[in-house]
Structures are given as C-alpha cells and as structure tokens.
C-alpha cells in the first residue's frame, strides 16, 4: 500500500486517511460514506475517459 504523497494507490483503489492505507473503491457500494470514496468518485471509471478530454 502506498503512503500519501509518495505514489497513488493502484487502479480501483483510493487512499483512506482514516485507515491509513489504500482501499478498494468497490467497497464504496456497501460503505459510500467512507473517506476514500471521494477519491474513487473523482477517478475516471474507465480507461477511455483518460484518452478523451
């Protein structure tokens, strides 16, 4: 797991300050109010979003 400020979490994950580790964005379905879910919502859901402005 990556520490904040060094490298981003792997694809499909987001940093949780509460838990001090990268967490799976998939878990936001069950726990949408988790702190890291904001980072998941901001991330592009599919690769093609990275290719087109």
């Amino acid at each position: 797991e990556q520490a904040p400020g060094t490298a981003p979490c792997s694809r499909g994950s987001s940093w949780s300050a509460d838990l001090d580790k990268c967490m799976d964005c998939a878990s936001c379905r069950a726990r949408p109010h988790s702190d890291f879910c904001l980072g998941c919502a901001a991330a592009p859901p599919a690769p093609f979003r990275l290719l087109w402005p």
């Epitope: 509460d18 838990l19 967490m23 964005c25 998939a26 878990s27 936001c28 379905r29 069950a30």
Partner: antibody, heavy 119, light 111 residues
Framework: EVKLGESGGGLVQPGGSMKLSCVAS????????MNWVRQSPEKGLEWVAE??????????HYAESAKGRFTISRDDSRSSVYLQMNNLRAEDTAIYYC??????????WGQGTSVTVSS | DIVLTQSPASLAVSLGQRATISCKAS??????????MQWYQQRPGQSPKLLIK???KLDSGVPARFSGSGSGTDFTLNIHPVEEEDTATYYC?????????FGGGTRLEIK
C-alpha cells in the same frame, strides 16, 4: 500483526446455551464490521451473523438458521465481539470463526473455537 | 439466497501445471464496474485465508501465480504454476447481498 482469538466453545447439550468471545488486535476495530462464520463437514462454510459500527447503531444481521436463537454483540472498548447462542441444536455443531470485514471481504480469520452440541 | 456452485469438488494437478476452479452463482453478483466475488484458501488444519477479492484483485502478499477472473455469474480461480504449498481447499464467497454465502469448496491435491 492482526490477531483474532476465539474462545468459549465446548460441549453442550441440545437446548442449551453458550457464549463465544473473540478478542481482536492489530487493526482499527471500531471501523470494521465483525462477522461470525462457522464450518462443519456437513454444511461447509456458513456465515452466521454480522454486527456493524456504532455509527450504524450497531446494526445486526443474521443467517436464517441463527435468527431468534443467536445474538451478536460487540464491545469496542475491549475490541471484542460475542455470539450468544441459545436453544442449541445438533446442527449447530461446528468450528466458529470471527472475522472482520470493512465491506465485502473477510480479511482475517482466527483459529476458531469448536462447538459440539450432543447429549 | 444466492447459491454458489463450485466445480470440480476435487482435483489433482502435477507440480508446475495449472489448476482451474470454477464458481457459478445462481444470480449475477456484478455491477458494470465490479464483481462482488472473493476466493479463500484453507490449508489442512488451518483457518481460511483471503486470496482474491472483487473477482480478480489479489490480496496483499498473495503470490502472482494466483489469478481470478469472471463477471456476472461465472468466475474462475487459476493457479499456475502450482506448488506443493497450494495443497488446500478453495472456496468462493459472494458479498452481493445478505446472506453472504460460500461455495462448497474445491480440494486441490498436488501430484
């Protein structure tokens, strides 16, 4: 290092009661839902009960086989979860494991405590 | 309840070869983005251990010879190349809804 220590198992007669305990360490207990899962040769792995967080008003959920007979509870100050089992039946004979889950995955498992219901 | 059917019930694979285990769900456990299926390993005399989460994501510390795939109702666990220490029973588990259910398990023996 995550540690989960189940205790309280043993031999009990049909219709009897038993309370299982699980003490946890090595992860932020108050942020994790806690589960009891049991395993028997007859039924394999079977989820039994789950308790959520203080912010969820300690919501509980049960397998159909546990409803009305089993009660899950937790003590965040002791990083412990409990399973009160009443009106035990022969089919409740199993190894009982506690396991934390943040949302979907049972991330860690203890060594389990064995429950035998027999006359 | 969602029923998970694993196959085969047991298999024997030669050291270094590929082991493939199937798990079929009685209804879809996937959204358009994620699949809510996990795989666990239980070595003889030990407790279950999480291997793969969300169908294909390896848990921390799990060797890369393990891989998971699938979506909807059909999921697969692959182990390649198998090693002696992979002798175990493997279980799938869904987290789509309550109650969580497990497959019946697949016992892997290394020849």
């Amino acid at each position: 290092e995550v540690k989960l220590g189940e205790s309280g198992g043993g031999l009990v007669q049909p219709g009897g009661s038993m309370k299982l305990s699980c003490v946890a360490s090595g992860f932020p207990f108050t942020k994790y839902w806690m589960n009891w899962v049991r395993q028997s040769p007859e039924k394999g792995l079977e989820w039994v009960a789950e308790i959520r967080l203080k912010s969820d008003n300690y919501a509980t959920h049960y397998a159909e086989s546990a409803k009305g007979r089993f009660t899950i509870s937790r003590d965040d100050s002791r990083s412990s979860v409990y399973l009160q089992m009443n009106n035990l039946r022969a089919e409740d004979t199993a190894i009982y494991y506690c396991s934390p889950t943040y949302a979907d995955t049972m991330d860690y498992w203890g060594q389990g405590t064995s429950v035998t219901v027999s006359s | 309840d969602i029923v998970l059917t694993q196959s085969p019930a047991s298999l024997a694979v030669s050291l270094g070869q590929r082991a493939t285990i199937s798990c079929k769900a009685s209804q879809s456990v996937s959204t358009s983005t994620y699949s809510y299926m996990q795989w666990y390993q239980q070595r003889p005399g030990q407790s279950p251990k999480l291997l793969i989460k969300y169908a294909s994501k390896l848990d921390s510390g799990v060797p890369a010879r393990f891989s998971g795939s699938g979506s909807g109702t059909d999921f697969t666990l692959n182990i390649h190349p198998v090693e002696e220490e992979d002798t175990a029973t493997y279980y799938c588990q869904h987290s789509w809804e309550l109650p969580y259910t497990f497959g019946g398990g697949t016992r892997l023996e290394i020849k």
